[in-house]
């Protein structure tokens, strides 16, 4: 499902837009040059950090733009079959259990914000890195017991949940669901990460309507 | 003006309970992790516990665990820890210092100027 | 647990004379991001403790620049190069990497 060549490009942000023009004037200046990219997307960052609002706007603008794409696309595209389970997601499923990292996060996105109110969230996002990555193992233990906790409550909640919203699954044969079954996890794992990517994106999404009040 | 103001402190009996407020002001309390040390007399500093900005996790040293609690209210910017089945070796002055975290790395920026405490019969 | 031990734990000094405090680590406090987990405190007489050095060798702001810090690992110096009626008091060492823990304390002290 995931090499479905029909399936719509993804939506590109402003930040994609940048780096992707500043690759077009790099390779026009140099034609045979060899990029080294971890210099080139720390030199991209820069620029960009730089770069008034102004300046974005023209980024903003085509990030806009290919959204408008990419919806209206998804609107017609029609995955292969085995796909389409994506599409209904029930809100009475219990909700994934945040990381070590993302519980830290939430402690501390609000004073990152607070002290710089001009950044964008991916530099908020960077600074928690950061953050993250600076702090003690020790000081981290705490985060990672407590996401702990909360996954296991939430594998409990979910084999409850499946129990009982699958009553037609006692029907089918036993054998066939063992066979499935290490499949079906296969594929729930990687619905569990598209998951906690598209949550991510609702709180990016809410922390920007945060940062237009500020 | 950072100011952290401990109160609550006195004399207290061994097994009996107390509980410290510390009172923030001069900056946004709910952003910082929050601490309480203390000091025997003529003792050293001892780190007691700490507590998250939110008030979701915290962490106590193994000399107090299970008998003193950290809370916070971040609606009222005060720091609290309750303190029972008080021994008289937990007699001290009792500080509340806000962490500061230079990206990760914490220190204690700012400390109040503490509240006595005395546990004897 | 990591053990702070503080040397010498009393320091008597002459006004503008240099002075230095020694910290030792059972364990080394250098994190995998090359900053050492270590601060130093000023406790003045009667007085509640104060900040002067962080991450092993960073004055905090309002700390004048005679006071520096440097080491790393187990090893680690406060120095005063000039020091002042002022600089009285007990002088302290903490580590940050696990849990918190400070070091006895070096009592500085006017000759």
């Known amino acids: 499902g995931k090499g479905d060549p029909k399936k719509p490009r993804g939506k590109m942000s402003s930040y994609a837009f940048f780096v992707q023009t500043c690759r077009e004037e790099h390779k026009k200046k140099h034609p045979d040059a060899s990029v080294n990219f971890s210099e080139f997307s720390k030199k991209c960052s820069e620029r960009w950090k730089t770069m008034s609002a102004k300046e974005k706007g023209k980024f903003e603008d085509m990030a806009k733009a290919d959204k408008a794409r990419y919806e209206r696309e998804m609107k017609t595209y029609i995955p292969p079959k085995g796909e389409t389970k994506k599409k209904f997601k029930d809100p009475n499923a219990p909700k994934r259990p945040p990381s070590a990292f993302f519980l830290f996060c939430s402690e501390y996105r609000p004073k990152i914000k607070g002290e710089h109110p001009g950044l964008s969230i991916g530099d908020v996002a960077k600074k928690l890195g950061e953050m993250w990555n600076n702090t003690a193992a020790d000081d981290k233990q705490p985060y990672e017991k407590k996401a702990a906790k909360l996954k296991e409550k939430y594998e409990k909640d979910i084999a409850a949940y499946r129990a009982k919203g699958k009553p037609d699954a006692a029907k089918k044969g036993v054998v066939k669901a063992e066979k499935s079954k290490k499949k079906k996890e296969e594929e729930e794992d990687e619905e569990d990460e598209e998951d906690e990517e598209e949550e991510e994106d609702e709180e990016d999404e809410e922390e920007e309507e945060d940062d237009d009040d500020e | 003006e950072v100011q952290l103001l401990e109160s609550g402190g006195g004399l207290v009996q061994p097994g009996g309970s107390l509980r410290l407020s510390c009172a923030a002001s001069?900056?946004?309390?709910?952003?910082?992790?929050m601490v309480w040390v203390r000091q025997a007399p003529g003792k050293g500093l001892e780190w007691v516990s700490s507590?998250?900005?939110?008030?979701?996790?915290?962490i106590y040293a193994d000399s107090v665990k299970g008998r003193f609690t950290i809370s916070r209210d971040n609606s009222k910017n005060t720091l609290y820890l309750q303190m029972n089945s008080l021994r008289a070796e937990d007699t001290a002055v009792y500080y509340c210092?806000?962490?500061?975290?230079?990206?990760?790395?914490?220190?204690?920026?700012?400390w109040g100027q503490g509240t006595l405490v005395t546990v004897s019969s | 647990d990591i053990q702070m031990t503080q040397s010498p734990l009393s320091l008597p000094v002459t006004p503008g004379e240099p002075a230095s405090i020694s910290c030792r680590s059972s364990?080394?406090?250098?994190?995998?991001?090359?900053?050492?987990?270590l601060d130093w405190y000023l406790q003045r007489p009667g007085q509640s403790p104060q900040l002067l050095i962080y991450?092993?060798?960073n004055r905090a702001s309002g700390v004048p620049d005679r006071f520096s810090g440097s080491g790393s690992g187990t090893d680690f110096t406060l120095k005063i190069s000039r020091v002042e009626a002022e600089d009285v008091g007990v002088y302290y060492c903490?580590?940050?990497?696990?849990?918190?823990?400070f070091g006895q304390g070096t009592k500085v002290e006017i000759k």
């Open positions: 001069g900056f946004t309390f709910s952003w910082y992790k």
């Open positions: 364990q080394s406090l250098l994190h995998g991001n090359g900053y050492n987990y």
């Open positions: 210092a806000r962490v500061q975290q230079w990206l990760g790395r914490p220190y204690f920026d700012y």
């Open positions: 991450s092993g060798s």
């Open positions: 507590i998250v900005p939110s008030g979701g996790i915290t």
């Open positions: 903490m580590q940050s990497l696990q849990s918190r823990t």
